[in-house]
Interface confidence: low
């Protein structure tokens, strides 16, 4: 579902996208345009993600710009005022609504904006078990920018003697290059165990661009929690598991 | 050994209000997703909240509103504030680790509410 | 929200009798459904988690198996200790809902 009206009351029932009118060709000068996203459950939250196609005039956001409030209308609390060509972060509100407004002026013009919507998911609902015999994990929204305030856990579960494969096809996290006194990824990262989460031995915990490489579990359980913070936001990964079936003797279980 | 103890159940009025605490032990109660689950007398299971590790909350649509669910980490304990409660809300209140799934239950406080 | 349909609702059956019981999801929950087992005046214990693991310290007797929407927990030797009542649940999304529960009882 795509929208190029000029506003518009978007109540969601499933992901789609708003634009500026006429993207991805020029917007119309001394347009006023707003939109309100509501989600259907008043306990729900809205995450919004901008097309990396980002074009508004760029002169200190005093003449084009976009503007994002947490709330239903202007007197919402500002999220943030935008424009140029580079396309803002994730926005995720604290309630069920978002309120966004786009002003050109009436001269120079870009292609404008295109912006996804869709209901924030988070804990229960970004967390997945896994029992096939091989899959694909990835972080939520990937390729696309992750969300901020994520408690995703993923669980490969696989019959007891058997072997499990874990290997990265993409790994992309905000970095932590100067950690104090020997703690590293303290914004986001991706924690690995085989096992249960705090339970079973820790493999590794990781952020930035050093990929974990090739991971091996064999106690059946392999778990990875991704948590990321209130702010940057990076690509995310993409991981392969299989499942290898153990050689050991059924008579040893 | 992992030990979950409710307590804070009784007799309340209704439109009244309680507090019920579950106690942890045996585990590093920081790591773990806790839930409150409800058992009306002579009925099944009924799912009431959750909350994640970080905070996080979730709610059955019947106590959206009224009821409060939180932690205090420093006393390993999960805590469910029950306002403006109704008779319909006579039940066992059980505290549930969430591991694989509601993996540790404790033996459960009994909420009665009537006039 | 998801409905979860348990039947049957009770079974007599005796010791040493193979036990199973369905639960139906109102629409596919992948292998998001867990078994518990209650006896009277007691809390519940988790049986089979992610459809058909069998959680820690529960006897080999007690199976769990399906996807998506049809679930199965089987007790292929029943004993004298099974006799209580058992509920399947899906995590696979809020609000979490639970079948209404099978009451296994002595034949």
């Known amino acids: 579902f795509r929208n190029d009206k000029c506003g518009d009351t978007i109540k969601i029932e499933s992901p789609g996208y708003l634009t500026s009118p006429g993207y991805p060709h020029s917007y119309h000068p001394s347009e006023k345009c707003e939109w309100l996203i509501q989600a259907p459950d008043p306990y729900q939250r809205i995450m919004i993600n901008f097309n990396p196609h980002f074009d508004l005039e760029d002169r200190d956001c005093k003449y084009d710009y976009v503007e994002v409030f947490d709330g239903e209308n202007e007197n919402g609390h500002f999220r943030g005022k935008f424009c140029g060509k580079i396309a803002p972060p994730p926005v995720v509100s604290s309630g069920p609504f978002l309120f966004i407004k786009f002003v050109s002026d009436y001269e120079t013009h870009g292609a404008g904006f295109s912006i996804r919507y869709e209901i924030f998911k988070r804990g229960p609902e970004c967390s997945q078990n896994y029992t096939t015999p091989s899959g694909v994990i990835k972080s939520p929204g990937f390729p696309e920018k992750y969300p901020n305030s994520l408690e995703c856990t993923y669980i490969v579960f696989v019959p007891k003697m058997s072997e499990i494969i874990l290997e990265f096809e993409s790994f992309d996290l905000e970095p932590d290059s100067n950690p104090p006194g020997g703690m590293f990824c303290r914004y986001d990262r991706l924690e690995i165990w085989d096992g249960f989460p705090d339970v079973g031995p820790h493999i590794g915990r990781y952020c930035g661009q050093k990929t974990p490489g090739r991971i091996r579990s064999s106690s059946g359980i392999l778990s990875m929690v991704f948590y990321t913070d209130s702010a940057i936001a990076k690509e995310g990964f993409s991981a392969n598991y299989s499942v290898l079936q153990s050689s050991v003797s059924e008579d040893f279980k | 050994e992992v030990q979950l103890l409710e307590s804070g159940g009784g007799l309340v009025k209704p439109g009244g209000s309680l507090r019920l605490s579950c106690a942890a032990s045996?585990?590093?109660?920081?790591?773990?997703?806790m839930s409150w689950v409800r058992q009306a007398p002579g009925k099944g299971l009924e799912w009431v909240s959750s909350?994640?590790?970080?905070?996080?909350?979730y709610y059955a649509e019947s106590v959206k509103g009224r009821f409060t669910i939180s932690r205090d980490e420093s006393k390993q304990t999960l805590y469910l504030q029950m306002q403006s409660l109704k008779t319909e809300d006579t039940a066992v209140y059980y505290c549930?680790?969430?591991?694989?799934?509601?993996?540790?239950w404790g033996q459960g406080t009994l909420v009665t509410v009537s006039s | 929200d998801i409905q979860m349909t348990q039947s049957p609702s009770s079974l007599s059956a005796s010791v040493g009798d193979r036990v199973t019981i369905t639960c139906r999801a109102s629409?596919?929950?992948?292998?998001?459904l867990n078994w518990y087992q209650q006896k009277p005046g007691k809390a519940p214990k988790l049986l089979i988690y992610?459809?058909?693991s069998l959680q820690s310290g529960v006897p080999s007797r007690f199976s769990g198996s399906g996807s998506g929407t049809d679930f199965t927990l089987t007790i292929s030797s029943l004993q004298p200790e099974d006799f209580a009542t058992y509920y399947c649940?899906?995590?696979?999304?809020?609000?979490?809902?639970f079948g209404g529960g099978t009451k296994v009882e002595i034949k």
């Open positions: 549930a680790r969430v591991g694989t799934a509601f993996d540790y």
């Open positions: 045996g585990f590093t109660f920081s790591s773990y997703a």
């Open positions: 909350i994640s590790r970080t905070g996080y909350t």
């Open positions: 629409q596919s929950i992948s292998s998001y």
């Open positions: 992610a459809a058909s």
């Open positions: 649940q899906q995590s696979y999304s809020t609000p979490l809902t």
